[in-house]
């Protein structure tokens, strides 16, 4: 039975150049986190994983840092970086649970942070 | 490449004990988590077991739990399956897996080994 | 635990062919279905995992698609190869469960 839920960042905004913190947090469950997954896309960005720590895909090396605690530090933005992102928990026994998060780089200085919210 | 060679299984009675063994080339083993899936002599396919990649946390379904225990020894490059209490219903061809990188499926499999309990 | 429908149990198609095997869950696992292929002496292979995503090395006739509790697999263009046992498995939610398979065979 998965009765635990996701609080996000929810819609985020930033300039380009600078930098931006991913976080999720997992709430309302007794269930083990034993890997969290970051995702763009369908594209693996990084992984923390309770035996090994992190791992940050290679081409994503250079630009993401793994923290603060579960959560992800995209770097150096560029306006490509615009989309959606996910925090995937994988959990013993509930299993998978799936944040998201929209990211909006601008050009400008205006990037302002959205309002938290929760996904059931 | 990578491959996965099971051994340890046979015949046991109903209420005996058996230990399968998986051996580990071609990857990493110590980054990867492990599974034990069987398939019935119905072809049914059934996860008995999982164990994350440092050994720290094993995972079972309820009908195998007290049962089965899932161990790995990472500088053997080895992964076990310990049977006690053996029933007519664990006869199967027991596989070995591993889980991909990003827990998503089982990428690579063994070809197998089969345990019949019966007296 | 959530139980997965495979159908059909049985397909019978002729190279070039495209066919679809349908997997049904009891209840919602988002995206999350794998697609193994099994053939006699060979080990089982992973072909889509996350519902549509394609295991690297698997040609692109395989595609997967759907989400919640709805899921097809496509094999385009049937190669004498692709003539085999297919199965599911639902990754969302312990017990991991599996579809209880289709065999494909040739027309």
């Known amino acids: 039975m998965m009765t635990g839920t996701i609080e996000t960042t929810g819609n985020i905004s930033a300039e380009k150049g600078g930098s931006i913190i991913l976080q999720c947090h997992l709430s309302s469950t007794t269930a083990q986190v034993t890997q969290v997954n970051w995702e763009q896309q369908d594209q693996l960005l990084a992984i923390c994983n309770a035996d090994l720590g992190w791992h940050i895909s290679p081409s994503f090396k250079d630009r993401v840092a793994p923290g603060p605690g579960l959560g992800l530090t995209l770097q150096s933005l560029t306006v490509n970086d615009t989309g959606e992102y996910f925090c995937i928990y994988h959990t013993y026994p509930d299993g998978t649970y799936t944040g998201r998060i929209f990211l909006e780089v601008l050009e400008s200085s205006v990037a302002e942070h959205g309002a938290r919210f929760q996904i059931p | 490449e990578v491959q996965l060679v099971e051994s340890g299984g046979g015949l046991v009675k109903p209420g005996g004990s058996l230990k399968l063994s998986c051996a580990a080339s071609?990857?990493?083993?110590?980054?990867?988590?492990m599974s034990w899936v069987r398939q019935s002599p119905e072809k049914r396919l059934e996860w008995v077991a999982e164990i994350s990649s440092g050994g720290s946390y094993t995972y079972y379904p309820d009908t195998v739990t007290g049962r089965f225990t899932i161990s790995r020894d990472n500088a053997k490059n080895t992964l076990y399956l310990e049977m006690s209490s053996l029933r007519s219903e664990d006869t199967a061809m027991y596989y070995c897996a591993r889980k991909r990188r990003d827990y998503y499926a089982m990428d690579y499999w063994g070809q197998g080994t089969s345990v019949t309990v019966s007296s | 635990d959530v139980q997965i429908t495979q159908s059909p149990s049985y397909l019978a198609a002729s190279p070039g062919e495209t066919i679809t095997i349908n997997c049904r869950a009891s209840?919602?696992?988002?995206?999350?279905l794998a697609w193994y292929q099994e053939k006699p002496g060979k080990t089982n292979k992973l072909l889509i995992y996350s519902g549509s995503t394609l295991q690297s090395g698997i040609p692109s006739r395989f595609s997967g698609s759907g989400s919640g509790t709805d899921f097809t697999l496509t094999i385009s263009s049937l190669e004498p190869e692709d003539f085999a046992m297919y199965y599911c498995q639902q990754h969302n939610e312990y017990p991991w469960t599996f579809g209880g398979g289709t065999k494909l065979e040739i027309k």
């Open positions: 071609g990857f990493t083993f110590s980054s990867y988590a």
């Open positions: 209840k919602s696992i988002s995206k999350y």
